[in-house]
C-alpha cells in the first residue's frame, strides 16, 4: 500500500527541522591548500626549524614530508616568489649520518638533491627551484601538512537548493 500524499508531506516537513548527512567529503581546513592527497599550510612568519616543527604539531599536522620528485615539483609550483623558501620535515641525523624525515624514515639517494652540507644541526628547506641544507637555527618560513581527511558535512536540505 502506497503512503498517502499527506503523510509524505508531513515527513518532509519534519525532516526539514533536522540536519541531513551528505556523503563523506575530502576537505582541507580553511587557509590550507589541497595538493593531491595532502593539505598544505604555508607560514607567513619565520622560525627556526624546531619551532616550525612545534608549530605544525599545534595545528595537528607535521612539517612537510616529500615522497618523491613529483611531489617536490608540485609543492615548488605553489611557491610563487623565488625569493622565499620554506623549511620541510627533513634534518641530518648525526648518529645515523644520514638525512632523516621526521616520520623516522631516511632519505633515499634519488629522492631529493640537497645543495649544502650534510652535518650536525643541518635542516632542509625548499625554494621555487632548489632544495638546500642550512643551520637549523636559521629563521625561515615553513610548510605544514595534513593528510586529507573525511569530513561529514551536516547541512540542512534547504541549503541544497
Amino acid at each position: 500500500q502506497k503512503p498517502s500524499i499527506g503523510k509524505c508531506s508531513v515527513d518532509i516537513q519534519q525532516n526539514r527541522t533536522k540536519t541531513t548527512e551528505r556523503p563523506d567529503l575530502l576537505n582541507c581546513p580553511i587557509y590550507w591548500q589541497q595538493v593531491q592527497e595532502k593539505c598544505l599550510l604555508f607560514s607567513h612568519t619565520v622560525n627556526p626549524w624546531n619551532n616550525s616543527l612545534a608549530d605544525c604539531s599545534t595545528k595537528e599536522s607535521s612539517l612537510l614530508l616529500i615522497q618523491d620528485k613529483d611531489e617536490l615539483t608540485r609543492t615548488q609550483n605553489l611557491i610563487h616568489d623565488k625569493a622565499i623558501s620554506f623549511w620541510i620535515g627533513l634534518n641530518f641525523s648525526l648518529s645515523e649520518k644520514n638525512w632523516k624525515w621526521i616520520n623516522g624514515s631516511f632519505l633515499s639517494s634519488n629522492d631529493l638533491k640537497i645543495t649544502g652540507d650534510a652535518k650536525e644541526n643541518s635542516c632542509v628547506y625548499i625554494s621555487q627551484t632548489s632544495v638546500y641544507s642550512e643551520y637549523c637555527s636559521t629563521e625561515m618560513k615553513w610548510i605544514c601538512q595534513k593528510e586529507l581527511t573525511l569530513v561529514r558535512n551536516k547541512v540542512s536540505p534547504d541549503s541544497w537548493l
Epitope: 607567513h44 612568519t45 623558501s85 649544502g116 625554494s127 637555527s137 636559521t138 618560513k141
Partner: antibody, heavy 122, light 108 residues
Framework: QVQLVESGGGLVKPGGSLRLSCAAS????????MSWIRQAPGKGLEWVSY????????AYADSVKGRFTISRDNAKNSLYLQMNSLRAEDTAVYYC???????????????WGRGTLVTVSS | DIQLTQSPSSVSASVGDRVTITCRAS??????LAWYQQKPGKAPKLLIY???ELQSGVPSRFSGSGSGTDFTLTISSLQPEDFATYYC??????????FGGGTKVEIK
C-alpha cells in the same frame, strides 16, 4: 613604499660613541635578517653585522667585535647599531640592508638604505 | 676569511659592447655569490644572487655564471645606465660576508 632610512650619523671624536638607527617600511620587517654594511670614502664595501629576525642570532665582523652592538625592535620596524670606542678607520657611510629571504644565512642584500655618514676625527 | 679578487679593476667600454667581469674566491664557495651595481653617491643594487639567479626587476642583459672559486658577470650589450662600479660578494653561511674590491666600468 618598500624602503630603509638610516639616521644618527655625524662627526665624533676617537673613542666616542654613536647610535645609528634604520627605519623600515613597506614590508614585514620581523621576517627578515638585517645587516649593517659600511663603505669608507672612495673604498669598497665591508659587511659589519647581522641580526636574525627574532634577534636570537647575531654576528659581527672581527674589525668591530666587542665595540659595536646590533639590535632591533620589530614592534617599531627598526634596526640599530650602537658604536662605541670609535676609531678613525670606522669613518664610512653606513648602510642598513635587508637580506633576501630565500637563502637563510646565505645573506644576499636585496634592499639598501641611502646610508648615513659617520666621521671619526679629532 | 674568504677573499674575493675581482678583475679587471676597471674597464673602458662603449655602448653596445659585451663586458665580462670575473671574481675569484680564495676557497670554494659553491654557488653562494652575488653581484651588485653601485653608482656614485648611491647605495649598491643587487643584480645576481646564487651565482646565476637574476634579481627581480634586473634587465636580462645581466647574467652570472660559475661555481666553486671562479665566477663571471656578463653584460651582453652595455647601456648608458650601466656605467658604474660592480662588486661581487660571497655568501657562505658563516660570516664575514666579504666583497670583492670592485670593477669600475667607464665610458671609452
Amino acid at each position: 613604499q618598500v624602503q630603509l632610512v638610516e639616521s644618527g650619523g655625524g662627526l665624533v671624536k676617537p673613542g666616542g660613541s654613536l647610535r645609528l638607527s634604520c627605519a623600515a617600511s613597506g614590508f614585514t620587517f620581523a621576517n627578515y635578517y638585517m645587516s649593517w654594511i659600511r663603505q669608507a670614502p672612495g673604498k669598497g664595501l665591508e659587511w659589519v653585522s647581522y641580526i636574525s629576525p627574532s634577534g636570537a642570532t647575531i654576528a659581527y665582523a672581527d674589525s668591530v667585535k666587542g665595540r659595536f652592538t646590533i639590535s632591533r625592535d620589530n614592534a617599531k620596524n627598526s634596526l640599530y647599531l650602537q658604536m662605541n670606542s670609535l676609531r678613525a678607520e670606522d669613518t664610512a657611510v653606513y648602510y642598513c640592508a635587508r637580506s633576501l629571504m630565500a637563502t637563510g644565512t646565505h645573506l644576499y642584500f636585496d634592499l639598501w638604505g641611502r646610508g648615513t655618514l659617520v666621521t671619526v676625527s679629532s | 676569511d674568504i677573499q674575493l679578487t675581482q678583475s679587471p679593476s676597471s674597464v673602458s667600454a662603449s655602448v653596445g659592447d659585451r663586458v665580462t667581469i670575473t671574481c675569484r674566491a680564495s676557497s670554494g664557495i659553491s654557488s653562494w655569490l652575488a653581484w651588485y651595481q653601485q653608482k656614485p653617491g648611491k647605495a649598491p643594487k643587487l643584480l645576481i644572487y646564487a651565482a646565476s639567479e637574476l634579481q627581480s626587476g634586473v634587465p636580462s642583459r645581466f647574467s652570472g655564471s660559475g661555481s666553486g672559486t671562479d665566477f663571471t658577470l656578463t653584460i651582453s650589450s652595455l647601456q648608458p645606465e650601466d656605467f658604474a662600479t660592480y662588486y661581487c660578494q660571497q655568501a657562505t653561511s658563516f660570516p664575514p660576508y666579504t666583497f670583492g674590491g670592485g670593477t669600475k666600468v667607464e665610458i671609452k
